[in-house]
Structure formats: C-alpha cells, structure tokens
C-alpha cells in the first residue's frame, strides 16, 4: 500500500544572524489525517517550534495556508534568527487519535546554522 | 482572466534535451501547486510532476533523474527541463495549476513534444 | 501508486439518456477524487471535485458520489456537448493518478 512520506528536501540551511530561515516539508499524501509539528532536536527533549493545530508562535509563518484541506505544503520561515537557534528542525506527522494525536512519521530533519551577522 | 500558455515542444532525437516553458496570468504561480501532466497521442492522462508553493518538488517514476520542474517568479512562469529524452516521452505535455495540490482547475492548451530519429 | 480502474472504457449513449461510469481505486482515497471531461485536441476540463463537487460553472446534469474505493460519475440527461473522454483522478497520494478513460460516443 502507499503511504505518506515527510520530505524535508534540505539537509542543512545556513542563514546570517538577523535573517529569516525557510525550512522546507512536504507530504507525498492527505491520508492519514492529523496535524504536523515542527520540533528542533529529537527525542524526548525535542523544542516544539511550530504546532498546525494550536498554540503562538509569533515568529513562525507558514508559505501554505494550511487550514486548507488539501495542503500538502508544510514549509515555514522563522523570522529574526539568531545563534541560539541553530540546530536540527524536524517536521513531524501525526495521526488524529482520541484523546490525543499519535506521531505518525518525521521527516529526515534540516540542520540549521547561524552565519554572524555581516559588519 | 486566469490563463496559461506552454510552448518549448517540438522534435527532438532520442537522447535529447527540451525545455518547456509555462507563462501564467491572472494569478501567480509561486502561491499555487502547479504540476504537468502529458497524454501520449491516442492515450490517456499520466501526470509527471508537481512544484509545490514551498519550491519542494515531486516526480513520476517514470521521469525521475530526467525532468526538473522549476519556476521563475519574476516572471510567472513553470519550466519543464526535459533530459536523456525517450521515444516513450512523446506526448503532448499540458501545465496545470492544482487547488492545493488536488484539482487540476486551469490547463494550458497543451504544448507537443515528439521524440524521434 | 494508486490504481484507478475506470469502467466502461467506452459507451454510446443517445441524448437524453442517463449516463453512468464508476471508478474504482487500488486503496482508500476517502473522498480525495476528481472528474474530467477532455474533448479531441483539446485540455481537459474539471467537472467535479472531492468526488461530489461540482465545479463553477459546471451544468447540474454532471454529478459525482462515492468514498473509500468506489466512485460513481452520472450525466443525467446526455446533451450534444457532452460526447467526450472523461476521467477519474485521485489527489490523496502522490504521484497523481488517472483512470483511464471512458469515452462517451453518439449511439
């Protein structure tokens, strides 16, 4: 059977202290439904960055609407990057379960590093 | 009016190399799924590949490591670059704009690519 | 992939007469699936969407049902302008897939 794939086409990104980062995901399927997450790191310790269901996250924009039912782009741009945000960003599927969604599958993650600011 | 227009088709040898250009108006391609699909002559509907609005790509089997879809937003338009060509890549290729991915809701008028000796 | 089967892959029909094709999909799609019309030398054209929606400007005699695996496509009352190739398409999974084909002739 088929079955959702995460691409997240970029190994790494660099990006200059002060700058957005675009940090690209990209599902291969609308099933299953569910919500996506974006976290820096992995594990049980990994920084939620981006939550498609609730939350603020002021310096996060989406390149997709993604209250649109068949979006399939994931992508988003943090804004204002500074060195404490380097690290590894995954973009993570989950599946809608009751009471709580289930993570379904994560993308292969994106390493981003912080260039000093140009003087 | 929303519009587009392919052109870049023609003949070319097996082995060959062509680039399809797609010049939309009325909306901009860079907030929109854009895929291309192609239909052999007498054949049915096969779509080859998709640019999502976040630049991620995605590829038929059939063309994979041989076709790159790209686009230019300065100048709205899609691009197919055609590689390593086929016999079996004759057909006439068509750019779409997707509805988020899955309606297929404005076509092009088709541009045709034969591959031939 | 996805394999959508379409049937019949060809029909006559007079004007007038009520028009049915089904498709039918290799897994669950829910009701990720789209209907076409293609005329001779011409792009395809969206008729329905997610199965039962119908396309602006599209007349009311085209419908679409189904979910899950099997899909119906109904002209209601055949008109001239209709005589076509229609086809199926599932959007719930890369890459695309078409059906294909049924075209509908003049008995």
């Known amino acids: 059977e088929d079955e959702l794939q995460v691409i997240q086409p970029e190994k790494s990104v660099s990006v200059a202290a002060g700058e957005s980062a675009t940090l690209r995901c990209a599902m291969t399927s609308l099933i299953p439904v569910g919500p996506i997450m974006w976290f820096r790191g992995a594990g049980a310790g990994r920084e939620l960055i981006y939550n498609q269901k609730e939350g603020h996250f002021p310096r996060v924009t989406t390149v997709s609407e993604l209250t649109k039912r068949n979006n399939l782009d994931f992508s988003i741009s943090i804004s204002n990057i500074t060195p404490a945000d380097a690290g590894t960003y995954y973009c993570v599927k989950f599946r809608k379960g009751s009471p709580d969604d289930v993570e379904f599958k994560s993308g292969a993650g994106t390493e981003l590093s912080v260039r000093a600011k140009p003087s | 009016e929303v519009q587009l227009v392919e052109s870049g088709g023609g003949l070319v040898q097996p082995g060959g190399s062509l680039r399809l250009s797609c010049a939309a108006s009325g909306f901009t391609v860079s907030s929109n799924y854009m895929s291309w699909v192609r239909q052999a002559p007498g054949k049915g509907l096969e779509w080859v590949s998709v640019?999502?609005?976040?630049?991620?790509?995605y590829y038929a089997d059939s063309v994979k490591g041989r076709f790159t879809i790209s686009r230019d937003n300065s100048k709205n338009t899609l691009y197919l670059q055609m590689n390593s060509l086929r016999a079996e890549d004759t057909a006439v290729y068509y750019c779409a704009r997707g509805q988020y991915t899955g309606s297929l809701d404005v076509w092009g008028q088709g541009t045709m690519v034969t591959v031939s000796s | 992939d996805i394999q959508m089967t379409q049937s019949p892959s060809s029909l006559s029909a007079s004007v007038g007469d009520r028009v049915t094709i089904t498709c039918q999909a290799s897994?669950?799609?829910?009701?990720?699936l789209n209907w076409y019309q293609q005329k001779p030398g011409k792009a395809p054209k969206l008729l329905i969407y997610?199965?039962?929606n119908l396309e602006t400007g599209v007349p009311s005699r085209f419908s679409g049902s189904g979910s899950g695996t099997d899909f119906t496509f109904t002209i209601s009352s055949l008109q001239p302008e209709d005589i076509a190739t229609y086809y199926c398409?599932?959007?719930?999974?890369?890459?695309?897939?078409f059906g294909g084909g049924t075209k509908v002739e003049n008995q």
């Open positions: 398409q599932q959007f719930a999974f890369l890459p695309l897939t």
């Open positions: 897994q669950d799609i829910s009701n990720y």
């Open positions: 997610d199965a039962s």
């Open positions: 640019i999502y609005s976040g630049g991620s790509t």
